[in-house]
C-alpha cells in the first residue's frame, strides 16, 4: 500500500507512518515504528500537557508567587495548568494573571458600579443627579439623596454628587 499523506484525528505522520498522539497528561517517549505503537509516559509531579500531543517534555505548572500577591485558585493536574488568582483586595493585571495590583477605590462623587474580583478591577461610575458619594471606597455605591419630604422636612441645602441634601424644619409662619 501507498504510504499515507494524512492521518486520522489523534494521529500524526512521521516516517510515512501514522502514529498515535499521546493523550493529555502524557508526553512522547518514542514515535511508533513498523513494529511498535507510540510510547508515552505520564507527566511528572508539577507538570502537565493539556492536548493530544507529541511533545517530548511536559510543561511546568504555573507558580502562583505570593510575593506578587498571587495565590492558587485551582491546583494543576497532569492535564491542566494551575490557575492563579489574587489575594483579597487585589486583582490580576492581565488575563494570564502573572501579577496583582490593589483594587481601585472610587473617589467622592463616584460610586462602585461593579465590585472588583480576583481578575477584574473596580468599575466606578459618576453619581447621577439625586445620588452622592462622600467617601473614597472600593465597595460603596452612590447613595440616593435623603428625601426631606418623607420626613416632613424641607431642603435647606441642595445635595451634590459628593454631599447629601441638608433637611430642615418647615417654616411654620404664614402671612
Amino acid at each position: 500500500p501507498e504510504p499515507p499523506t494524512a492521518c486520522r484525528e489523534k494521529q500524526y505522520l512521521i516516517n510515512s507512518q501514522c502514529c498515535s498522539l499521546c493523550q493529555p497528561g502524557q508526553k512522547l517517549v518514542s514515535d511508533c515504528t513498523e513494529f511498535t505503537e507510540t510510547e508515552c509516559l505520564p507527566c511528572g509531579e508539577s507538570e502537565f500537557l493539556d492536548t493530544w500531543n507529541r511533545e517530548t517534555h511536559c510543561h511546568q505548572h504555573k507558580y502562583c508567587d505570593p510575593n506578587l500577591g498571587l495565590r492558587v485558585q485551582q491546583k494543576g493536574t497532569s492535564e491542566t495548568d494551575t490557575i492563579c488568582t489574587c489575594e483579597e483586595g487585589w486583582h490580576c493585571t492581565s488575563e494570564a494573571c502573572e501579577s496583582c495590583v490593589l483594587h481601585r477605590s472610587c473617589s467622592p462623587g463616584f460610586g462602585v458600579k461593579q465590585i472588583a474580583t480576583g481578575v477584574s478591577d473596580t468599575i466606578c461610575e459618576p453619581c447621577p443627579v439625586g445620588f452622592f458619594s462622600n467617601v473614597s471606597s472600593a465597595f460603596e455605591k452612590c447613595h440616593p439623596w435623603t428625601s426631606c419630604e418623607t420626613k416632613d422636612l424641607v431642603v435647606q441645602q441642595a445635595g451634590t454628587n459628593k454631599t447629601d441634601v441638608v433637611c430642615g424644619p418647615q417654616d411654620r409662619l404664614r402671612a
Epitope: 516516517n15 507512518q17 498515535s20 517517549v29 514515535d31 515504528t33 513494529f35 511498535t36 505503537e37
Partner: antibody, heavy 115, light 112 residues
Framework: QVQLVQSGAEVKKPGASVKLSCKAS????????IYWVKQAPGQCLEWIGG????????NFNEKFKSRATLTVDTSISTAYMELSRLRSEDTAVYYC????????WGQGTTLTVSS | DVVMTQSPLSLPVTLGQPASISCRSS???????????LHWYQQRPGQSPNHLIY???NRFSGVPDRFSGSGSGTDFTLKISRVEAEDVGVYFC?????????FGCGTKVEIK
C-alpha cells in the same frame, strides 16, 4: 545511510561477563530504540530487550532481565549490552537492530562461552 | 509468552514456482490500536536477518513484489509468487504485539 556496526567476536569462560557494543551512524541516535536479539546455533531467535537512547528507558524479556544490562553512550552514538554470569548456553550470535523508517541490523557479534 | 509456530520446517521448491509458508501464533496478534504486529524476514546463509514484510502485509522498501503477506488474528501466510535462486534461505515470522517479542523457528527454503 543508516549503519549499525558491532564489536568483534568474544571468547569467554563460564561465570565471566562480556560487554558487546553497537555503534550507530547515519541517523539521529536518540530518535530510535536499539534492540538486541540472540541467535544460538540450532535454536529459535530470542528477543533480549531494547533501550531508548533518549532517556535510557529499557524493556526486557524477563528471561534475560537478571543478567543483561543495556546502556547507551549518546556522545558516541553507541549502545551496549553487558551479559553477566555467562554459561555455555549463552554461546550465540548477538545482533543489535533498529526499526522506524526501515529496519536495520548490525552484522552480529559471535560470543563463545567455553571452559 | 506468545508461541510462534511455522510450517513447514523445510520447503524444497522449483525455480519459478510459488511457495507458501504458514505462521500461527498462540494468541491473537491484534493490538488494541487496531494494528497487527506480525512480520516476516529472510536470512541468507552467513548474513544478518533482512526484513521483508511488516504488519502482516506491508512490504519494506526494495522488497520485490513477488513477496506478499496475508492473514489476521493468529493465522498468517507468506507467499512467494515465483521463487528465484536468490530467495534461498531461512524465513522467520515474528510478533511485536506482546512483550516479550517472539519469533518462529524458521522455514528453510531450498531449490529442488
Amino acid at each position: 545511510q543508516v549503519q549499525l556496526v558491532q564489536s568483534g567476536a568474544e571468547v569467554k569462560k563460564p561465570g565471566a561477563s562480556v560487554k558487546l557494543s553497537c555503534k550507530a551512524s547515519g541517523y539521529t541516535f536518540i530518535s530510535y530504540y536499539i534492540y538486541w536479539v540472540k541467535q544460538a546455533p540450532g535454536q529459535c531467535l530470542e528477543w533480549i530487550g531494547g533501550i531508548n537512547p533518549r532517556n535510557g528507558g529499557t524493556n526486557f524479556n524477563e528471561k534475560f532481565k537478571s543478567r543483561a544490562t543495556l546502556t547507551v553512550d549518546t556522545s558516541i552514538s553507541t549502545a551496549y549490552m553487558e551479559l553477566s554470569r555467562l554459561r555455555s548456553e549463552d554461546t550465540a550470535v548477538y545482533y543489535c537492530t533498529r526499526h522506524g523508517n526501515g529496519v536495520y541490523w548490525g552484522q552480529g557479534t559471535t560470543l563463545t562461552v567455553s571452559s | 509468552d506468545v508461541v510462534m509456530t511455522q510450517s513447514p520446517l523445510s520447503l524444497p521448491v522449483t525455480l519459478g514456482q510459488p511457495a507458501s509458508i504458514s505462521c500461527r501464533s498462540s494468541q491473537s496478534l491484534l493490538h488494541s490500536n487496531g494494528n497487527t504486529y506480525l512480520h516476516w524476514y529472510q536470512q541468507r546463509p552467513g548474513q544478518s536477518p533482512n526484513h521483508l514484510i511488516y504488519q502482516v502485509s506491508n512490504r519494506f522498501s526494495g522488497v520485490p513484489d513477488r513477496f506478499s503477506g496475508s492473514g489476521s488474528g493468529t493465522d498468517f501466510t507468506l507467499k512467494i509468487s515465483r521463487v528465484e535462486a536468490e530467495d534461498v534461505g531461512v524465513y522467520f515470522c515474528s510478533q511485536t504485539t506482546h512483550v516479550p517479542w517472539t519469533f518462529g523457528c524458521g522455514t528453510k527454503v531450498e531449490i529442488k
